[in-house]
Interface confidence: low
Amino acid sequence: MGSAALEILGLVLCLVGWGGLILACGLPMWQVTAFLDHNIVTAQTTWKGLWMSCVVQSTGHMQCKVYDSVLALSTEVQAARALTVSAVLLAFVALFVTLAGAQCTTCVAPGPAKARVALTGGVLYLFCGLLALVPLCWFANIVVREFYDPSVPVSQKYELGAALYIGWAATALLMVGGCLLCCGAWVCTGRPDLSFPVKYSAPRRPTATGDYDKKNYV
């Protein structure tokens, strides 16, 4: 597969992953009530996210409440907020870096420097995926630990919500996309003769040493 194709595929995966990460960050379904034996309130489900909690009745009526105070939030929610928002913003930065390093753009002149910019974009996406993975796994670990903790009352036990699964899928896309971008950039830096069209100018005159002027070669 050509470097341009790797670049395009990598960027598409990263963009989809970025969208998934934004969705996971905003959804109030990081944890959902686990119906272990019965409904604590007849036919009612509770969803909890990073920004709000929702109560869904069996009728389909949903009532959501945005968390009032940041200080009242648990450490894990505050940390998850900070890390996921950082990952989303970093992915935004990575997008511009990747576009600048893309072969189809003219932000940076073709050459090793451009390939290095593209490589940086790929690495940023990889780091972005890892950064998002931390709160997702941390949060999941807490949910699972509390689920099996006998000191947590049965009605307060939660299961992993859809947002966590979306988040994991998004991080996988970001990391795979980042790897593809890195591979595309690697091809460029490793094989410059094939990656970039080189215009040769006609030799003017031999130098005093009889060699051709080095500037005629990339």
């Epitope: 119906f35 272990l36 034996d37 019965h38 409904n39 604590i40 309130v41 007849t42 006998p150 000191s151 009352p153 049965v154 009605s155 307060q156």
Partner: antibody, heavy 120, light 112 residues
């Protein structure tokens, strides 16, 4: 109307065994956790065992004094709750109640009880 | 394990009198996430099985007369009967359902 009817109690010798049964009706048995609670003559209530629903893999819990001797089980298709009591001791003599863990985690419905007497 | 202690063990009262019985737990029954106390009160009349009166420490079960009131939080709880009736003759048990299930020793309400 919710009904819990216990049966199977009787006179047993120490180290003996017995199986207590509870027939449930009037509610969706398979989604509720069920318990056995006992009451020794003239004494207070003591929680004995709990079994959760199928969605919780029928997880079981016991009070320390009956662990390894009593086995709680259920048959959702028949809406039946059971307590297999083995290696009985005289201190196991009590009225055994079948109890439903209700929507608020506490015990909202109780059976009338079945008497288990352990004596030589 | 959580240990539940009830006092008094016996409570002689007259019809129409207001009575209060207490229940103490060895550890807090308040779950901070939902601000609920995992404590229930049961009534057991002579020759009958227990009946749920109060859950979440202060919420009356449907059908329970409003003369029964539960209060308290954390480790200290009370059950108050505002005006005792002859039919209230029973043993009253508190129960924690925060971690597994433990009952108090009971308070016997006796009519003078």
């Amino acid at each position: 109307e919710v009904q819990l009817v216990e049966s199977g109690g009787g006179l047993v010798q120490p180290k003996g065994s017995l199986k207590l049964s509870c027939a449930a009706s009037g509610f969706t048995f398979n989604i509720y956790a069920m318990h056995w609670v006992r009451q020794a003559p003239g004494k207070g209530l003591e929680w004995v065992a709990r079994i959760r629903s199928k969605s919780s893999n029928y997880a079981t819990y016991y009070v320390d004094s009956v662990k390894d001797r009593f086995i709680i089980s259920r048959d959702d298709s028949q809406s039946m709750l059971y307590l297999q009591v083995n290696n009985l001791k005289t201190e196991d003599t009590a009225m055994y109640y079948c109890v439903r863990e209700g929507n608020w985690d506490c015990f909202d419905y109780w059976g009338q009880g079945t008497t288990l007497t352990v004596s030589s | 394990d959580i240990v539940m202690s009830q006092s008094p063990s016996s409570l002689p009262v007259s019809v129409g009198q207001k009575v209060t019985m207490t229940c103490k737990s060895s550890q807090s029954l308040l779950y901070t996430s939902n601000q609920k106390n995992y404590l229930a009160w049961y009534q057991q009349k002579p020759g009958q099985s227990p009946k749920l009166l109060i859950y979440w420490a202060s919420t009356r079960e449907s059908g329970v007369p409003d003369r029964f009131t539960g209060s308290g939080s954390g480790t200290d709880f009370t059950l108050t009967i505002s005006s005792v009736k002859a039919e209230d003759l029973a043993i009253y048990y508190c129960q924690q359902y925060y971690r597994y299930h433990t009952f108090g020793g009971g308070t016997r309400l006796e009519i003078k």
